[in-house]
Interface confidence: medium
């Protein structure tokens, strides 16, 4: 059966009723976060390998909404939820407190001030 | 402004009112074509870098609907239309008459009998 997906901002990717957009311009994590906010979205949150299996095919590295909280040592998303076990393979690329998404559900630790491309997401 | 995308088959990716699905199982070109046809779709047709800019981020190699016609030497799509100039960079990976899509709008020539993952597309 065929169905409509969304609603999403114009020209965003819609998959399993979530909206995604990949941005080419390189920004630091904070600027990337603000850019997503300006579009009523947030940086990518990975919550399900099944519902987000399109992400396994993404090439390159992109900021997502995952950050390290030094006070308690946890990795958490912008909305305050803690990273679920076995969802991402966290790899220490650099010393840092922010994470880049890379294909096949990998998260690369990077300095938050480093410019990178980024992925915004809007849950419908 | 927000809008709905589609309609698409359930759990396909919708982007600029086209539907895409990436299939993990490796099949030869003919089997891949048949698989897409069975879902009322066809193998990926690249017709616009702008309308299909999500394809630039795809990692790995996947069968698309581009084939070489030995009689006139042209590359054409399943629907019979000729490959537009400057749309794909064609790279001879193997001797063959079928083409794999790879990121950043590259087409890799491959033997049609070689198993590969594939991308189906449905234009709405």
């Amino acid at each position: 059966t065929e169905s409509y997906c969304g609603p999403c901002p114009k020209n965003w990717i819609c998959y399993k009723n979530n909206c995604y957009q990949f941005f080419d311009e390189s920004k630091n994590w904070y600027e990337s976060q603000a850019s997503c906010m300006s579009q009523n979205a947030s940086l990518l949150k990975v919550y399900s390998k099944e519902d987000q299996d399109l992400l396994k095919l993404v090439k390159s590295y992109h900021w997502m909404g995952l950050v390290h909280i030094p006070t308690n040592g946890s990795w958490q998303w912008e909305d305050g939820s803690i990273l679920s076990p076995n969802l991402l393979t966290i790899i220490e690329m650099q010393k840092g407190d922010c994470a880049l998404y890379a294909s096949s559900f990998k998260g690369y630790i990077e300095n938050c001030s480093t410019p990178n491309t980024y992925i915004c997401m809007q849950r419908t | 402004t927000e809008s709905y995308c589609g309609p698409c088959p359930k759990n396909w990716i919708c982007y600029k009112n086209n539907c895409y699905q990436f299939f993990d199982e490796s099949k030869n070109w003919y089997e891949s074509q048949a698989s897409c046809m069975s879902q009322n779709a066809s193998l990926l047709k690249v017709y616009s870098k702008e309308d299909q800019d999500l394809l630039k981020l795809v990692k790995s190699y996947h069968w698309m609907g581009l084939v070489h016609i030995p009689t006139n030497g042209s590359w054409q799509w399943e629907d019979g239309s000729i490959l537009s100039p400057n749309l794909l960079t064609i790279i001879e990976m193997q001797k063959g008459d079928c083409a794999l899509y790879a990121s950043s709008f590259k087409g890799y020539i491959e033997n049609c009998s070689t198993p590969n993952t594939y991308i189906c597309m449905q234009r709405t």
């Epitope: 630091n28 600027e31 603000a34 906010m37 979205a41 958490q76 305050g80 938050c112 001030s113 | -």
Partner: antibody, heavy 123, light 107 residues
Framework: QLQLQESGPGLVKPSETLSLTCTVS??????????WVWIRQSPGKGLEWIGN???????HYNPSLKSRVIISVDTSKNQFSLKLKSVTAADTAVYYC???????????????WGQGTTVTVSS | DIQLTPSPSFLSASVGDRVTITCRAS??????LAWYQQKPGKAPKLLIS???TLQSGVPSRFSGSGSGTEFTLTISSLQPEDFATYFC?????????FGQGTKVEIK
């Protein structure tokens, strides 16, 4: 501690450009994690977010003002500025420069404000 | 844009009273809401953000609650220095927006 100070003319003629500068002291404007904000307050419209800027020059503007506003930054002077073009009487307001509170990588309101400068648009 | 509607817009109360101010958002904003106090001729002062987290130096008689679209600011026992105007602000998405404010006056 961080302090912000607005400066600029208090009276602007209709159709002209309003120009204000905010000087940051007690901290560097170049911190990659901060952005800097302009907010205005008028009796008619209440508090209104105008826009913000990072030290890199990246900006976000209120869509209602976007066609008329430019926010820029001068890291060498530790200042950021606001220009609002084609002003009318409706732009009469107290203009504040400010810094949002950053905690655990999210902005939680505005914790440092300038004292505000009153701008009147009148001929 | 996300609209914020405070209620009431005006409130008359006495020292020692318990005061509750509500802010309703036009769409869900999680807990990304801030409360400010403003006195005449001064810049607003951040009291609470997000939603229920008291800023350092703010007296414990102030508290906040809510998430989604309904938020409240409560002053458990009104003090003379609390007579002011209170604003809510959403930080869920740009453009950041503010409520019109609730003015708390002496009865």
């Amino acid at each position: 501690q961080l302090q912000l100070q607005e400066s600029g003319p208090g009276l602007v003629k209709p159709s002209e450009t309003l120009s204000l500068t905010c000087t940051v002291s007690g901290g560097s404007i170049s911190s990659s994690s901060y952005y800097w904000v302009w907010i205005r307050q008028s009796p008619g419209k209440g508090l209104e977010w105008i826009g913000n800027i990072y030290s890199s020059g990246s900006t976000h503007y209120n869509p209602s003002l976007k066609s008329r506003v430019i926010i820029s930054v001068d890291t060498s002077k530790n200042q950021f500025s606001l220009k609002l073009k084609s002003v009318t009487a409706a732009d009469t307001a107290v203009y504040y420069c400010a810094k949002p509170l950053l905690r655990d990588y999210y902005y939680y309101g505005v914790d440092v404000w300038g004292q505000g400068t009153t701008v009147t648009v009148s001929s | 844009d996300i609209q914020l509607t405070p209620s009431p817009s005006f409130l008359s109360a006495s020292v020692g009273d318990r005061v509750t101010i509500t802010c309703r958002a036009s769409q869900a904003i999680s807990s990304y809401l801030a409360w400010y106090q403003q006195k005449p001729g001064k810049a607003p002062k951040l009291l609470i953000s997000p939603a229920s987290t008291l800023q350092s130096g703010v007296p414990s008689r102030f508290s906040g609650s809510g998430s989604g679209t309904e938020f409240t600011l409560t002053i458990s026992s009104l003090q003379p220095e609390d007579f002011a105007t209170y604003f809510c602000q959403q930080l869920n998405s740009f453009p950041w927006t503010f409520g019109q404010g609730t003015k708390v006056e002496i009865k």
